[in-house]
Interface confidence: medium
């Protein structure tokens, strides 16, 4: 959460001679409240906007307006507060609208814009129009807040911006997940144009639940430069789970740009399908039948016989 | 050599939570989970739940569910099991154990009392 | 859950003799079955898994055997440093769960 760096912070429109500065987040009006305070504002309206930096970088910006409410409190209305809180930090940017001239009614409804808030992708944020002065302890609140989620590096939008393409959003892998036999998963995906390895995560659930009964991890090592944006495959062993068959594959890259924090792709398989007329269930149900023919120990990343190969 | 090094005893009243780690070293810690088991003086061993350190999907005894909870931190190779609203039958020496299923490392336990 | 019964709870031996424990599941559990060791004041130590296998470096005169519900875990000739509780473990079904332990005292 920062301001756009190089840009002239301006807000002053006809009739109106306004500064912008960097803010505590903290009034002063807090700490001496005025008797007469203005109104909160009419409405605010908050979009996603791109916008380069002074690097050319391309970055997602909240565009945050809003509207004064036509009432004679804008005649004590002295600037105005925008605060920006990112939900699950906690961190919180402020800036201040200071009015250098007194407002007067005209033939139009007062319109302030700002959009200088750089955000991240995936994020959700509570902007927040304070009017200043702001009230006194039990006077009426003068500001209004709204939420408000910055999609995440899928939207067509935001994957051309500088943080996603950084964490890998122009890849494409195509996951595909085939189920060979009650054993074995083949997953197919397409390797990206760098010599680089990945990872796949193979997390198994029970049919209508959420937590997992299985985990296995499986390493693929950097393709060769002749093998990008080839198609791999890689075939998994399950641990023949009973009970346990809904499969989720989740394939991380480790790209140059974002080492571990890369954006990863998943891809599920369903239970199979339930017959009409089910057997009767017993009142347990075991996580997996027992393996033929296999003294290796098979838990978390031992899967025993993965392999992988990539093809043209 | 793989190793698990847990943190020192505590003492808790009744009502309060505990919070115990389990430092691994000797593996890439992202490639198992962690199993916690506890003991409680001459008593047998209770499976509580794991942890994966890769994804932080976790899967809980349910006698312990709403009390217990799981954590990693992948920075410092670190599992965390924090039980809360302690009782005098928690009084247990607490493992960690490396694996999801069948535990082939395991820490060198945590004597937690719980005692007015 | 799955209930693990262990037979005897405690057994007298002279060292260099052939030791049976036994471990009864309520229900199947394939071979999905461990064996620990635990001596006084220790963490377990890993034995036995899916039922038969050795852990890394255990010696050979452990063995495990079964499949379904009842195992065993036989020590060839005892040695004085195999005094300790053994605890049988099931991890076909969650909640996983442990038998009550055998301990393996000097007659």
């Known amino acids: 959460l920062r301001l756009l760096d190089h840009r002239a912070l301006v807000c002053s429109q006809p009739g109106l001679n306004c500064t912008v500065k960097n803010s505590t987040c903290l009034d002063d009006s807090w700490i001496h409240p005025r008797n007469l305070t203005p109104s909160s504002p009419k409405n605010i309206y908050i979009n996603l906007s791109v916008s380069s930096t002074q690097h050319g970088e391309l970055v997602p910006v909240l565009h945050v307006e809003w509207t004064l409410q036509t009432d004679a409190s804008i005649l004590y209305l002295e600037g105005a507060e925008l605060s920006v809180l990112q939900l699950n930090t906690n961190e919180r940017l402020c800036v201040r609208f200071e009015f250098l001239s007194k407002l007067r009614h005209h033939h139009r409804r007062w319109r302030f814009t700002f959009s200088h808030f750089v955000v991240d992708p995936d994020q959700e944020y509570e902007v927040t129009v304070h009017h200043l002065p702001k009230p006194i302890p039990d006077g009426d609140p003068n500001h209004q807040s709204k939420n408000f989620l910055v999609p995440d590096c899928e939207h067509a939008r935001m994957k051309v911006t500088t943080p996603c393409m950084s964490s890998g959003s122009l890849w494409d892998p195509n996951i595909t997940v085939e189920t060979l036999d009650t054993q074995h998963l083949r997953v197919d995906f397409t390797l990206w144009n760098e010599s680089t390895h990945y990872q796949i995560l193979l997390t198994s659930f029970p049919h209508m639940e959420n937590h997992s009964c299985f985990e296995h991890m499986h390493h693929i090592p950097a393709p060769r430069p002749e093998e990008f944006h080839q198609r791999s495959n890689v075939t998994l062993t399950l641990r023949n789970l009973k009970g346990c068959c809904r499969h989720q594959v989740q394939i991380q890259p480790f790209f140059s740009s974002c080492l571990n924090d890369c954006l990863r792709h998943s891809a599920t398989v369903s239970c199979p399908e339930m017959p009409d007329t089910p057997e009767p269930i017993p009142d347990y149900m075991p996580l997996w039948e027992p393996r033929s023919g296999s003294s290796d120990y098979k838990d978390d990343d031992d899967k025993g016989s993965s392999h992988h190969h990539h093809h043209h | 050599q793989v190793q698990l090094v847990q943190s020192g005893a505590e003492v808790k009243k009744p009502g309060a939570s505990v919070k115990v780690s389990c430092k691994a070293s000797?593996?890439?810690?992202?490639?198992?989970?962690i199993s916690w088991v506890r003991q409680a003086p001459g008593q047998g061993l209770e499976w509580m739940g794991w942890i994966s350190a890769y994804s932080g999907n976790t899967n809980y005894a349910q006698k312990l569910q709403g009390r217990v909870t799981m954590t990693t931190d992948t920075s410092t190779s670190t599992a965390y099991m924090e039980l809360r609203s302690l009782r005098s039958d928690d009084t247990a020496v607490y493992y960690c154990a490396r694996r999801q299923l069948y535990f082939d490392y395991w820490g060198q336990g945590t004597l937690v009392t719980v005692s007015s | 859950e799955i209930v693990m019964t262990q037979s005897p709870a405690t057994l007298s031996v002279s060292p260099g003799e052939r030791v049976t424990l036994s471990c009864r599941a309520s229900?199947?559990?394939?071979?999905?079955l461990a064996w620990f060791q635990q001596k006084p004041g220790q963490a377990p130590r890993p034995l036995i898994y899916d039922a038969s296998t050795r852990a890394a470096g255990i010696p050979a005169r452990f063995s495990g055997s079964g499949s379904g519900t009842d195992f065993t875990l036989t020590i060839s000739s005892l040695q004085s440093e195999d005094f300790a509780v053994y605890y049988c473990?099931?991890?076909?079904?969650?909640?996983?769960?442990f038998g009550g332990g055998t301990k393996v005292e000097i007659k």
């Open positions: 473990q099931q991890y076909d079904n969650w909640p996983l769960t």
């Open positions: 000797g593996y890439t810690f992202t490639r198992y989970g």
């Open positions: 229900q199947s559990v394939s071979s999905n």
